[in-house]
């Protein structure tokens, strides 16, 4: 609603504020086709959208940043939308000794906030 | 040098890429004058500057983001400059039961990276 806390309600309209979005990417897109075998295509969740004042503030620093951006927009940038957590994903890749499965903890975003 | 690893060398020129910068802020600037007593003025280190391709990438996700931004700039945003670590700071503030010292772990940035 219009009266929701600014942390949770996007004043810019649906889908405009910081959120998680799925981006399809092939191994070729990532430049990984020479060392990753599977999967051939990744569903990469990424953080996109704007960070209006106090929306999904990551912490106290982000709240301060938002406020100072309002006062000195030329000097202090607005907070921006970045991952708050990640979903681990397993890739099959080539190694010197053959093929192995490797878990990557920081590859796919699971949640987003404004930092 | 021109051949330095992109993580460490700013291709945009001195001071243009993601770095730590000190911003002076009063309690009034922060809207804290009614509950914080000291310090009257804070030296707030903040992360500012651009994140060109692979510059100070926070992790694998940020490297992917940089690459996909190059391929789909309208769909995937460039990585942005955010704190990688914080310096704890103590504030003296009012509480319901009086005045006390409180440590804030996430108020002043200590380092920056591109996420």
């Amino acid at each position: 609603s219009a009266h929701a806390h600014p942390r949770d309600s996007c004043p810019l309209g649906p889908g405009r504020c910081c959120h998680l979005e799925t981006v399809q990417a092939t191994l070729e897109d990532l430049g990984w086709s020479d060392w990753v075998l599977s999967p051939r295509q990744l569903q990469l969740s990424m953080c996109v959208g704007e960070c209006p004042h106090l929306y999904r503030s990551a912490n106290t620093h982000a709240q301060i940043k938002a406020r100072l951006h309002g006062l000195q927009p030329d000097k202090v940038p607005a907070p921006c939308c970045v991952p708050s957590s990640y979903t681990p994903v397993v890739l099959m890749h080539r190694t010197d000794s053959g093929v192995s499965l490797q878990t990557y903890d920081d590859l796919v975003a699971r949640g987003c906030h404004c930092a | 040098s021109a051949h330095a690893h992109p993580r460490d060398s700013c291709p945009l020129g001195p001071g243009r890429c993601c770095h730590l910068e000190t911003v002076q802020a009063t309690l009034e600037d922060l809207g804290w004058s009614d509950w914080v007593l000291s310090p009257r003025q804070l030296q707030l280190s903040m992360c500012v500057g651009e994140c060109p391709h692979l510059y100070r990438s926070a992790n694998t996700h940020a490297q992917i983001k940089a690459r996909l931004h190059g391929l789909q700039p309208d769909k995937v945003p460039a990585p942005c400059c955010v704190p990688s670590s914080y310096t704890p700071v103590v504030l003296m503030h009012r509480t319901d039961s009086g005045v006390s010292l409180q440590t804030y772990d996430d108020l002043v940035a200590r380092g920056c990276h591109c996420a």
């Epitope: - | 007593l37 000291s38 310090p39 310096t87 704890p88 700071v89 103590v90 504030l91 003296m92 005045v99 006390s100 010292l101 440590t103 002043v108």
Partner: antibody, heavy 118, light 107 residues
């Protein structure tokens, strides 16, 4: 909440060097703005501030004792130290350490007693 | 050095009384004054910071006031547990200095 505890030799002879340790928990001297002071109190008398060390290693001393005092810290071990050279019977007192920020000295140790006697 | 003077070194009062302890600085200390309570066992507690700000957790019967060079600590309703020695301390400039203390006793 901060907790501080002083330790020292208990008894010294005149001209010896006093080494005191303040071990603390519940806060850190890596925190911007934080500091620790040493204060002493001869039996039945008032309090006397001796020295202060800040998080950034800035140090302050009581001018009349400055030549005899050295304050230092080990941030990683949560300890602050005070050395007093050439002790005399006038240095017989209870020595306290206390945490402080912005002049607010909010938590004190229980004190450690020193007797200087030949 | 700034001299801090507590003219009353000891004070006798009855339980329930309103007690005022005074402290004078040798120069203007701009409200940079703390009040401490020291119990007979040596335990020291901060009561008041910046002349009038009650430290968190201190009973509201304690209050501080003053400005310039003259300051006071008031206990509005004296309780048995308030039997102690009270010290003022300036932190306007180094070296920080304390008053000589006021010992509070029960009549």
């Amino acid at each position: 909440q901060g907790t501080l505890k002083e330790s020292g030799p208990g008894i010294l002879q005149p001209s010896q060097t006093l080494s005191l340790t303040c071990s603390f928990s519940g806060f850190s001297l890596s925190i911007s703005g934080m500091g620790v002071s040493w204060i002493r109190q001869p039996s039945g008398k008032g309090l006397e501030w001796l020295a202060h060390i800040y998080w950034d290693d800035d140090k302050r001393y009581k001018p009349s004792l400055k030549s005899r005092l050295t304050i230092s810290k080990d941030t990683s071990r949560n300890q602050v130290f005070l050395k007093i050279t050439s002790v005399d019977t006038a240095d017989t007192a209870t020595y306290y350490c206390a945490r402080s920020a912005y002049g607010m000295t909010d938590y004190w140790g229980q004190g450690t007693t020193l007797t200087v006697s030949s | 050095d700034i001299q801090m003077t507590q003219t009353t070194s000891s004070l006798s009062a009855s339980l329930g009384d309103r007690v005022t302890i005074s402290c004078r600085a040798s120069q203007d200390i701009s409200n940079y004054l703390n009040w401490y309570q020291q119990k007979p066992d040596g335990t020291v507690k901060l009561l008041i910071h910046s002349a009038s700000n009650l430290h968190s957790g201190v009973p509201s019967r304690f209050s501080g006031s003053g400005s310039g060079t003259d300051y006071s600590l008031t206990i509005s309703n004296l309780e048995q547990e308030d039997i102690a020695t009270y010290f003022c301390q300036q932190y306007n400039m180094f070296p920080w200095t304390f008053g000589g203390g006021t010992k509070l006793e029960i009549k």
